[in-house]
């Protein structure tokens, strides 16, 4: 979490930011909030980027306002126009690019004054695992996948059973690139299971922690998925 | 130590060409916008063009468009300035300022100049 | 383009006197004006951002102030090391554009 103060002639307002992660080609928010007016009219709302030339976004006047947009950011975004009035200056990106991490400055200007503050973003791809039992195999063998991720994860086996258990050796990961040439699926083979036992497949990476969870016993497999965006802080 | 050190200046006839080099150092350097601003003998400032960061965007004045060519090498932490069709009035000292964030930050840090004298 | 009037050009003032620098844009450009120091022989340094806020570092002798055309520059008590000249620059819009400079000067 950020906090920015204005610090100006006129007043300082409060600004608020939570760092967060896009997940690319999907669309992605960037949250912002401050100290809200009465009129719509006397709020300014600009999102800059670090070494960008024109703006991310700018919305005044109780519209946008994008003469001054970036050409990396056409048509690409939106604010959230009838929660302004209340507060929120938050960002909707579009189609998430590699190239849009980096820092982004939410810049308030109301009737009460002004103020900022930084928000981190980062940008990857992150999707949940799935682990299922591999009949094909020749012994008792786990298989788990999830279809994009970037830059390249670490998976990790556990077992409830087997707490602390390093399954390095008796696992096998491999990484398939995409047709974007961008994202890549993961694949990883657990073998010699036991039953009556819970495995679970961890995947991570600097932006998103994932994990496939999967129980089994003699009558029924039971299956369960998480996935967990690292490093969201408020500013 | 933040810094930024021009080179490149120096004489050239009225006509030719010249190019300008501000090596960067102490910061990351693709997270800044970098701009070129000159200050004729005696004179005020005087802008002269803009780069992005990941150098995909420029910004010219009108009194250089067409002549001039901004341009960076992030691997080498360095920015250029080409100067084609030099003329008289384009003496001038020649400085490059970073600028991290457009319109609310400001050009916090330039760097000491370089000479760049055109005449016959 | 964004047309920057300060004034006066030039001024003398004496030691712990308030000095004040106008600077008058063309059009509105909200907060997004930058003030700066040159002196002599020196490459310019950033003393004001966004019209009213400290670059890290500089005295708090200085300040600024004012929004949309009309913006302030105050040395509140005039030091010897001030003498210089004072630019103002806007950041609302390409082409950048600076006033055409206050030289301060002591009595």
């Known amino acids: 979490l950020i906090i920015g103060f204005g610090i100006s002639g006129r007043h300082s307002i409060t600004v608020t930011t939570v760092a967060s992660a896009g997940n690319i080609g999907e669309d992605g928010i960037l949250s912002c909030t401050f100290e809200p007016d009465i009129k719509l009219s006397d709020i300014v709302i600009q999102w800059l980027k670090e070494g960008v030339l024109g703006l991310v976004h700018e919305f005044k006047e109780g519209k946008d306002e994008l003469s001054e947009q970036d050409e990396m950011f056409r048509g690409r975004t939106a604010v959230f126009a009838d929660q302004v009035i209340v507060g929120n200056a938050s960002l909707r990106l579009k189609n998430v690019q590699l190239t849009d991490a980096g820092t982004y400055k939410c810049y308030i200007i109301t009737s009460k004054g002004k103020g900022n503050a930084n928000l981190e973003y980062k940008t990857g791809a992150f999707s949940m695992p799935e682990v299922n039992v591999d009949y094909n195999a020749s012994s008792e063998t786990l298989r788990c996948e999830a279809p994009r991720w970037f830059p390249q994860p670490t998976v990790v086996w556990a077992s409830q059973v087997d707490q602390g258990a390093n399954f390095s050796e008796v696992s096998n990961t491999s990484f398939e690139l995409n047709s974007e040439n961008v994202t890549m699926k993961v694949v990883s083979v657990l073998y010699n299971v036991t039953i009556n036992n819970t495995y679970s497949c961890m995947i991570e990476n600097d932006i998103a922690k994932a994990t496939g969870d999967i129980k089994v016993t003699e009558s029924e497999i039971k299956r369960r998925s998480h996935l967990q965006l690292l490093n969201s802080k408020a500013s | 130590e933040v810094q930024l050190v021009e080179s490149g200046g120096g004489l050239v006839q009225p006509g030719g060409s010249l190019r300008l080099s501000c090596a960067a150092s102490?910061?990351?350097?693709?997270?800044?916008?970098m701009h070129w601003v000159r200050q004729a003998p005696g004179k005020g400032l005087e802008w002269v063009s803009a780069?992005?960061?990941?150098?995909?965007?420029?910004r010219y004045a009108d009194s250089v468009k067409g002549r001039f060519t901004i341009s960076r090498d992030n691997s080498k932490n360095t920015l250029y300035l080409q100067m084609n069709s030099l003329r008289a009035e384009d003496t001038a000292v020649y400085y490059c300022a970073r600028d991290r964030f457009r319109k609310v930050h400001g050009f916090d840090v330039w760097g000491q100049g370089t000479l760049v004298t055109v005449s016959s | 383009d964004i047309q920057m009037t300060q004034s006066p050009s030039s001024l003398s003032a004496s030691v712990g006197d308030r000095v004040t620098i106008t600077c008058q844009a063309s059009q509105d450009i909200s907060n997004y004006l930058n003030w700066y120091q040159q002196k002599p022989g020196k490459a310019p340094k950033l003393l004001i951002y966004d019209a009213s806020n400290l670059e890290t570092g500089v005295p708090s002798r200085f300040s600024g102030s004012g929004s949309g055309t009309d913006f302030t520059f105050t040395i509140s008590s005039l030091q010897p090391e001030d003498i210089a000249t004072y630019y103002c620059?806007?950041?609302?819009?390409?082409?950048?554009?600076f006033g055409q400079g206050t030289k301060v000067e002591i009595k």
């Open positions: 102490g910061f990351t350097f693709n997270s800044y916008a």
């Open positions: 780069i992005s960061g990941n150098g995909g965007s420029t």
């Open positions: 620059q806007q950041d609302a819009t390409f082409p950048l554009t």
